[in-house]
Interface confidence: low
């Protein structure tokens, strides 16, 4: 058998790696980098030509509990006048993210991974028009 | 932590947030979406704004293949297909948590880490700074 | 499109034996897994194998009772499955998937075949 190329090494388990029963992952949820910010530019989502506004959604059996999602503020672009122009389009711009989920089964509790979607912003796109023969 | 409510027939044992450490299943919830910005939709070239985007791939991380997006222009595209550079491009930054394996090259133990993305762009209006 | 029809599903007495195979036809991808669901339960990772047939990833459960392989064409990949339980009953499916990490993330696999009822007695 020929030796797994560098791209495997997620195969090959060191002997210091901690017992993990079937099936399962041990998973260590004290964040890296937990008190990274971030460094957008100021009032982003009121400057821009497609403008949003922000939702926080809260979940106690989820972890982070807060997640925020964008929602776009009109369905086309502001334009220089500061009117709507609805040839153009505001659309979403998502990303996903990990969250654990907290499970209750009677008095037994699990956890779970989750891939959530968050919209993080908007953008103004041209529309793609189709034509009907 | 966060504090979780509990059924009020459990013995007392059952901490209230969530521990340090949990053992969690190795499937991953949430089949809807999709991780290839490039296949789920065409607004990085179709928006006024364009950007780029990055394949960053780390096999320590999960998932190992995440796309950082940078802005083509300073400027934003006009009607008129030209760059405009009375308005600006912007990269739209998102928070988002990924698992890192923990110890290295570990199968099936992670710790959780807070990464910054550049998940697309938007076209701002710019703040003008006046100079007395 | 990569289009996958599995085939070699039936009923088998506890400590049996079957021998699963996926028909792959379309463009190349990096990995083939198969993937099992059982009634009520999530859909799990069985065993995968990549592109190049070098490199073969089980899930714990099935290791050492199963074999995955593929032939050197590489449009058609097998589970050898022996010492079967009544636990590893379910509905069998083939999947592709890009990428070789995480193999056991269900969520990565991107084609996936209508399945095959693999059914273990007591």
């Known amino acids: 058998r020929k030796i797994p190329k560098v791209g495997h090494t997620f195969f090959q388990k060191p002997e210091s790696c901690p017992p993990v029963p079937g099936g399962s992952m041990k998973l260590d949820i004290g964040i890296i980098n937990e008190n990274q910010r971030v460094s957008m530019s100021r009032n982003i989502e009121s400057r821009s030509t497609s403008p949003w506004n922000y939702t926080v959604t809260w979940d106690p059996n989820r972890y982070p509990s807060e997640v925020v999602q964008a929602q776009c503020r009109n369905l086309g672009c502001i334009n220089a006048q500061g009117k709507e122009d609805i040839s153009m389009n505001s659309v979403p711009i998502q990303q996903e993210t990990l969250v654990v989920r907290r499970k209750h089964q009677g008095c037994s509790v699990s956890f779970q991974l989750e891939k959530v979607l968050v919209t993080v912003g908007c953008t103004c796109v041209t529309p793609v028009i189709h034509h009907v023969q | 932590g966060i504090t979780i409510p509990r059924n009020p027939g459990c013995p007392n044992s059952e901490d209230k947030n969530f521990p340090r450490t949990v053992m969690v299943n190795l499937n991953i919830h949430n089949r809807n979406t999709n991780t290839n910005p490039k296949r789920s939709s065409d607004y990085y070239n179709r928006s006024t704004s364009p950007w780029n985007l990055h394949r960053n791939e780390d096999p320590e991380r999960y998932p190992s293949v995440i796309w950082e997006a940078k802005c083509r222009h300073l400027g934003c595209i006009n009607a008129d297909g030209n760059v405009d550079y009375h308005m600006n491009s912007v990269p739209i930054q998102q928070e988002i948590l990924v698992l890192r394996r923990e110890p290295p090259h570990c199968p099936n133990s992670f710790r959780l880490e807070k990464i910054l993305v550049s998940v697309g762009c938007t076209c701002v209006t710019p703040i003008v700074h006046h100079v007395a | 499109e990569v289009q996958l029809v599995e085939s070699g599903g039936g009923l088998v007495q506890a400590g049996g034996s079957l021998r699963l195979s996926c028909a792959a036809s379309?463009?190349?991808?990096?990995?083939m897994g198969w993937l099992r669901q059982a009634p009520g339960k999530e859909r799990e990772f069985v065993a995968a194998i990549s592109g190049s047939g070098d490199d073969t990833y089980y899930a714990d459960s099935v290791k050492g009772r199963f074999t995955i392989s593929k032939d050197n064409a590489g449009i058609t990949m097998y589970l050898q499955m022996n010492s079967l339980k009544p636990e590893d009953t379910a509905v069998y499916y083939c999947?592709?998937?890009?990428?070789?990490?995480?193999?056991?993330?269900?969520?990565?696999?991107?084609?996936w075949g209508q399945g095959t009822q693999v059914t273990v007695s007591s």
């Open positions: 999947a592709t998937r890009r990428g070789l990490y995480y193999v056991w993330d269900t969520n990565d696999y991107e084609n």
């Open positions: 379309g463009r190349t991808y990096d990995a």
